[in-house]
């Protein structure tokens, strides 16, 4: 769940989720609308779709606690859990890796944007 | 070749805490990925999963009996080990240990199981 | 927790006969695991995956699914194949059984 996700996006990027993240551009953080604002706002819109695909498959996305190992910069989602919590550490993975790889292109004045000026069509999934 | 056994009291009275062990052979729990679980069967009713402990000392339990579970192991001895507290007779069954398979969502060997009574 | 509901809980066959025993998810799982349980005995794998038998299981026996929805099928029903068959789902946590359904031989 959330506690997951934002322990593994720390120690990915090194940045605080809260602080730096959550929200961030159109669609990091709860909810999402519009285009999104730049490489990093893509992470979080990719990952909101693998999340919406996880809903669709019955699964708990925001109550569901998996295991994960990091080391040497690196995370591997522990195999022992059920099929949801296994999806739920992929997509948490995937979403802390591309804030990373984007940590390069991350705007300050992106942090807590005004959600209404999120305009244009929100990219399907 | 995988073998499991279980053993147990065989009857035991309510309120009473019961131990199980489960006695392996053939794989060893120190072994990335393995895992053993407990599940159980009442008489006349389905199988109802109880607990998993993994290589690593990694524990699961079934949330409804979570309270009442505590599973563990001693890899040297190839033993797993589950105690239930303040039984009553619903806790009546036979007991089976099981092992699952590195990165599998099912149980690939089973032991022969051991009925417990639980008496009022 | 997701809920498996067999059906029926109780059937017979005759022999030659084709055999299906139906497990319904009370939500949607990714695949579904079956067990086959004699009397007297413990319960083997039969099938993983929701269409892949287990080691030794005979190409009679065969299961499909998706969603809500899985079965196991015999295309001809054997005396051997009088047991107890189980499903089971660790699509999400718990990990769950089907009450099971039972296989006569008529």
């Known amino acids: 769940g959330i506690l997951n996700l934002n322990k593994m996006v720390k120690q990915v990027t090194g940045k605080m989720p809260i602080l730096s993240y959550w929200p961030y551009g159109c669609h990091c953080g709860l909810g999402g609308r519009g285009q999104p604002k730049d490489a990093t706002d893509w992470c979080c819109q990719t990952h909101d779709c693998c999340y919406d695909h996880l809903k669709t498959q019955g699964c708990s996305i925001y109550k569901d606690y998996y295991r994960y190992n990091f080391s040497q910069g690196n995370i591997h989602c522990s195999d022992k859990g059920s099929w949801c919590e296994q999806q739920l550490c992929a997509c948490d993975k995937e979403v802390a890796f591309c804030l990373k790889r984007n940590l390069d292109t991350y705007q300050k004045r992106l942090r807590f944007y005004w959600r209404p000026h999120c305009r244009g069509q929100t990219p399907g999934c | 070749q995988v073998t499991l056994k279980e053993s147990g009291p065989g009857i035991l009275q309510s309120s009473q805490t019961l131990s199980l062990t489960c006695s392996f052979s053939?794989?060893?729990?120190?072994?990335?990925?393995?895992?053993v679980a407990w599940i159980r069967r009442p008489s006349g009713k389905g199988l109802e999963w109880l607990a998993h402990i993994y290589w690593d000392d990694d524990k699961r339990y079934n949330p409804s009996l979570k309270s009442r579970l505590t599973i563990s192991k001693d890899t040297s001895r190839n033993q797993v080990f589950l105690k239930i507290t303040s039984v009553d007779t619903a806790d009546t069954a036979t007991y089976y240990c099981a092992r699952r398979g590195p990165g599998t969502w099912y149980f690939d060997v089973w032991g022969t199981g051991t009925t417990v009574t639980v008496s009022s | 927790q997701i809920v498996l509901t067999q059906s029926p809980a109780i059937m017979s066959a005759s022999p030659g006969e084709k055999v299906t025993i139906s497990c319904s998810a009370s939500?949607?799982?990714?695949?579904m695991y079956w067990y086959q349980q004699k009397p007297g005995s413990s319960p083997k794998p039969w099938i993983y995956?929701?269409?892949n038998l287990a080691s030794g299981v005979p190409a009679r026996f065969s299961g499909s699914g998706s969603g809500t929805s899985y079965s196991l099928t015999i295309s001809s029903m054997e005396a051997e194949d009088a047991a107890t068959y189980y499903c089971q789902q660790y699509h999400s946590s718990p990990l769950t059984f089907g009450a099971g359904t039972k296989l006569e031989l008529k």
């Open positions: 995956r929701t269409s």
């Open positions: 053939g794989f060893s729990l120190s072994t990335s990925g393995m895992g």
């Open positions: 939500s949607s799982v990714s695949y």
